[in-house]
Amino acid sequence: QNASRGRRQRRMHPNVSQGCQGGCATCSDYNGCLSCKPRLFFVLERIGMKQIGVCLSSCPSGYYGTRYPDINKCTKCKADCDTCFNKNFCTKCKSGFYLHLGKCLDNCPEGLEANNHTMECVNIVHCEVSEWNPWSPCTKKGKTCGFKRGTETRVREIMQHPSAKGNLCPPTNETRKCTVQRKKCQKGERGKKGRERKRKKPNKGESKEAIPDSKGLESSKETPEQRENKQQQKKRKVQDKQQKSVSVSTVH
């Protein structure tokens, strides 16, 4: 930003342009640049008790530029301001201050919060969520068949994440218990939601087939476990015939 900084030249008289350096059009030994070459900005820098004129390609931090017909001039922003549009309107505050409507503040006003990235006071943003999606089918261990009591879930999306002081988001999924009329799993039916069923490690001599839920594939040798399974299934068939209700859902 401080390109073409004007260097003071000794033995120069005011309003003499020969020998001026660093963008000065006219300069003096005592005051440095008095005027600048075209398109450069004139700024007065305080050095001790005296002010030195300097010519720059753009105004330094803490100053704003005005392009008058006869001079491009840098004017100081307010003390707490790093970049400004004019004396009244700051656009970037110095470290430790927060920008709010053109002013630099120590703390943000009530109802606003400090954004420590932009160093501005911003509106507090509360979480916003969508409407609930429909309930999922009733499942148990990822299956939609071969059981009577399972669970169903529904989800909603976060539409707006909250800011630091904003209200936190409510839960985005909800699960409840559900009761359905037992339905036999058809041959090869998994009823799974993508996931593979966990396979039990077979004992010695057992088939590596996964244990079927109903009339599934069976190994030639029937294990005690498989026999027990068959008996359970027969019992379930009888219970199912006795049941009249089809699908009762209750939230717990």
Epitope: Y64, T66, R67, Y68, P69, D70, F85, N86, K87, N88, F89, T91
Partner: antibody, heavy 116, light 107 residues
Framework: EVQLVESGGGVVQPGRSLRLSCAAS????????MAWVRQAPGKGLEWVAT????????YYRDSVKGRFTISRDNSKNTLYLQMNSLRAEDTAVYYC?????????WGQGTMVTVSS | DIQMTQSPSSLSASVGDRVTITCLAS??????LVWYQQKPGKAPKLLIY???RLQDGVPSRFSGSGFGTDFTLTISSLQPEDFATYYC?????????FGQGTKLEIK
């Protein structure tokens, strides 16, 4: 509270003179460039002249150069516009305004009518 | 001088409408653009400076955007008090110049 109050407007014949004043309060007058902006009836805004904060430099629109003179008295917090050789096309509401790149503060305006 | 061209010159809209006014500069003015609102018989009031920054007290339904030569003023949901004339002004260099104004009227 910032206040700019214009006075001196009125009806004047072409070729005659008028002097407008603007009394400022509620801000540091001597820190600001000051300007006159005018608005002809039913028309848009038109910048007329600006004087820098210390009175050392003045700027005018071409159509008023040599006829209008802007001046200020920082000890009295007052801005002036001396208008000579007035023409019919100078008829407008004249606003005084604090001019710091934008026109941040405005007066309520004073009407100048140039008519024979 | 830098010429500022505003469009449209007049606009009819209803309360609740979203309205956009554009301002075109004849040369690059960076973000040195100001918007004013003026009501009949009143002085202009500064709304937006530096192309997009809201002046204190201006409702957030007003917004400004643009850089270089193309700028817009948007009112997201018109309120009865927004019916007025709007002017853009380049603050890039002297001599300061205004757009010709956009009169926003009730439909």
């Amino acid at each position: 509270e910032v206040q700019l109050v214009e006075s001196g407007g009125g009806v004047v014949q072409p070729g005659r003179s008028l002097r407008l004043s603007c009394a400022a309060s509620g801000f540091t007058f001597s820190d600001y460039d000051m300007a006159w902006v005018r608005q002809a009836p039913g028309k848009g805004l038109e910048w007329v002249a600006t004087i820098i904060y210390d009175g050392s430099r003045t700027y005018y629109r071409d159509s008023v150069k040599g006829r209008f003179t802007i001046s200020r008295d920082n000890s009295k917090n007052t801005l002036y516009l001396q208008m000579n050789s007035l023409r019919a096309e100078d008829t407008a509401v004249y606003y005084c305004a604090a001019h710091d790149r934008s026109f941040d503060y405005w007066g309520q305006g004073t009407m100048v009518t140039v008519s024979s | 001088d830098i010429q500022m061209t505003q469009s449209p010159s007049s606009l009819s809209a209803s309360v609740g409408d979203r309205v956009t006014i554009t301002c075109l500069a004849s040369e690059d003015i960076s973000n040195d653009l100001v918007w004013y609102q003026q009501k009949p018989g009143k002085a202009p009031k500064l709304l937006i400076y530096a192309a997009s920054r809201l002046q204190d007290g201006v409702p957030s339904r007003f917004s400004g955007s643009g850089f270089g030569t193309d700028f817009t003023l948007t009112i997201s949901s018109l309120q009865p008090e927004d019916f007025a004339t709007y002017y853009c002004q380049q603050s890039y260099k002297y001599l300061p110049t205004f757009g010709q104004g956009t009169k926003l009227e009730i439909k």
